[in-house]
């Protein structure tokens, strides 16, 4: 891996949990800035496999509110606005980290927790097997 | 919104920065035991928006790597296997959560960064604007 | 690799009922969703009902939305089909199928045959 030149002016890390511990500022840094808010607002309407989206909330953890797509149909809409069931609406998932409160109800200790949420849905061609 | 209850047990917060900086043990808790492994292995590849996936490593974030979706086409793949260009392949965006060594190049501090990544892609119908 | 047989077809009046079931084996760990097609003669295939393996939502094909119903018991590996109110127009043979998202399979089909 990469070696990184250690800067003499990091916090002390003299703690018998390191490196597993570390102190983490919440204090968000957004990249984003340029982006274009609306940037997929309406897709999940216009998608030919369209998906709502479902509020998850979950105190003891950061972010608390997450947002879960579910594709609206098993097919994917087709030219004429129907639901064609020989394609596939899909969720597509991604692994996001989040912060879990840890011990439970400590409003400044956590631990760091891999979650799998559905972002959005993609319409897919299934292949086709006959199964005796 | 919600009071939480505070735990007797929790780590001391005497630090002058609370509750802006955090305890986090990095020892992640995978949540995602009983997923699918083949989820969405191939769905970058069948979809009628496919996509392409780039790897982004940063060894001043972490996770340091994080792999980034790029449209192939403008249009999406039709029943007879052509690019449609009346319709869009667009990419499903997500902000997440990473940290970020802060003061750079130290082990155990960081802040918390938002930042916005390109999960796969969709197709979706254009609303078509006829100008003068 | 996954296995899957159909059984309940046959013969039935008009305005009777009959219950297709779809015993499912093999690799299905890869569910996503699964359900009913139908083929009537000289006819494509057309979709009749669906179940999402995540949420357990139910999906049907606008011509059988009422008067068909679709269920499955876990315990059993076994998909079934109730289907009530039978048209002619429902005469057709009706396969059972699994789909990973990426993959579908189709059993071999069981034939109903519905009388004026």
């Known amino acids: 891996g990469i070696t990184i030149p250690r800067n003499p002016g990091c916090p002390n890390s003299e703690d018998k949990n390191f490196p597993r511990t570390v102190m983490v500022n919440l204090n968000i840094h957004n990249r984003n800035t340029n982006t274009n808010p609306k940037r997929s607002s309406d897709y999940y309407n216009r998608s030919t496999s369209p998906w709502n989206l479902h509020r998850n909330e979950d105190p003891e953890r950061y972010p608390s509110v997450i947002w879960e797509a579910k594709c609206r149909h098993l097919g994917c809409i087709n030219a004429d606005g129907n639901v064609d069931y020989h394609m596939n609406s899909v969720p597509i998932q991604q692994e996001i980290l989040v912060l879990r409160r840890e011990p439970p109800h400590c409003p400044n200790s956590f631990r760091l927790e891999k979650i799998l949420v559905s972002v959005g849905c993609t319409c897919v061609t299934p292949i086709v097997h006959h199964v005796a | 919104g919600i009071t939480i209850p505070r735990n007797p047990g929790c780590p001391n917060s005497e630090d002058k920065n609370f509750p802006r900086t955090v305890m986090v043990n990095l020892n992640i808790h995978n949540r995602n035991t009983n997923t699918n492994p083949k989820r969405s292995s191939d769905y970058y590849n069948r979809s009628t928006s496919p996509w392409n996936l780039h790897r982004n490593e940063d060894p001043e974030r972490y996770p340091s790597v994080i792999w980034e979706a790029k449209c192939r086409h403008l249009g999406c793949i039709n029943a007879d296997g052509n690019v449609d260009y009346h319709m869009n392949s667009v990419p499903i965006q997500q902000e997440i959560l990473v940290l970020r060594r802060e003061p750079p190049h130290c082990p155990n501090s960081f802040r918390l960064e938002k930042i916005l990544v390109s999960v796969g892609c969709t197709c979706v119908t254009p609303i078509v604007h006829h100008v003068a | 690799q996954v296995q899957l047989v159909e059984s309940g077809g046959g013969f039935v009046q008009a305005g009777g009922s009959l219950k297709l079931s779809c015993s499912v084996s093999?690799?299905?760990?890869?569910?996503?969703?699964m359900g009913w097609f139908r083929q009537p003669p000289g006819k494509g295939r057309e979709f009749v009902a669906g179940?999402?393996?995540?949420?357990?939502?139910?999906f049907y094909g606008d011509s059988v939305r009422g008067r068909f119903t679709i269920s499955g018991d876990n315990a059993k590996h076994t998909l079934y089909l109730q289907m009530n109110s039978l048209k002619p127009d429902d005469t057709a043979v009706y396969y059972c199928?699994?789909?990973?998202?990426?993959?579908?399979?189709y059993g071999q089909g069981t034939l109903v045959t519905v009388s004026s």
């Open positions: 179940i999402r393996w995540s949420d357990g939502s139910t």
């Open positions: 199928y699994i789909d990973s998202g990426s993959d579908r399979y």
């Open positions: 093999g690799n299905t760990f890869i569910t996503n969703h």
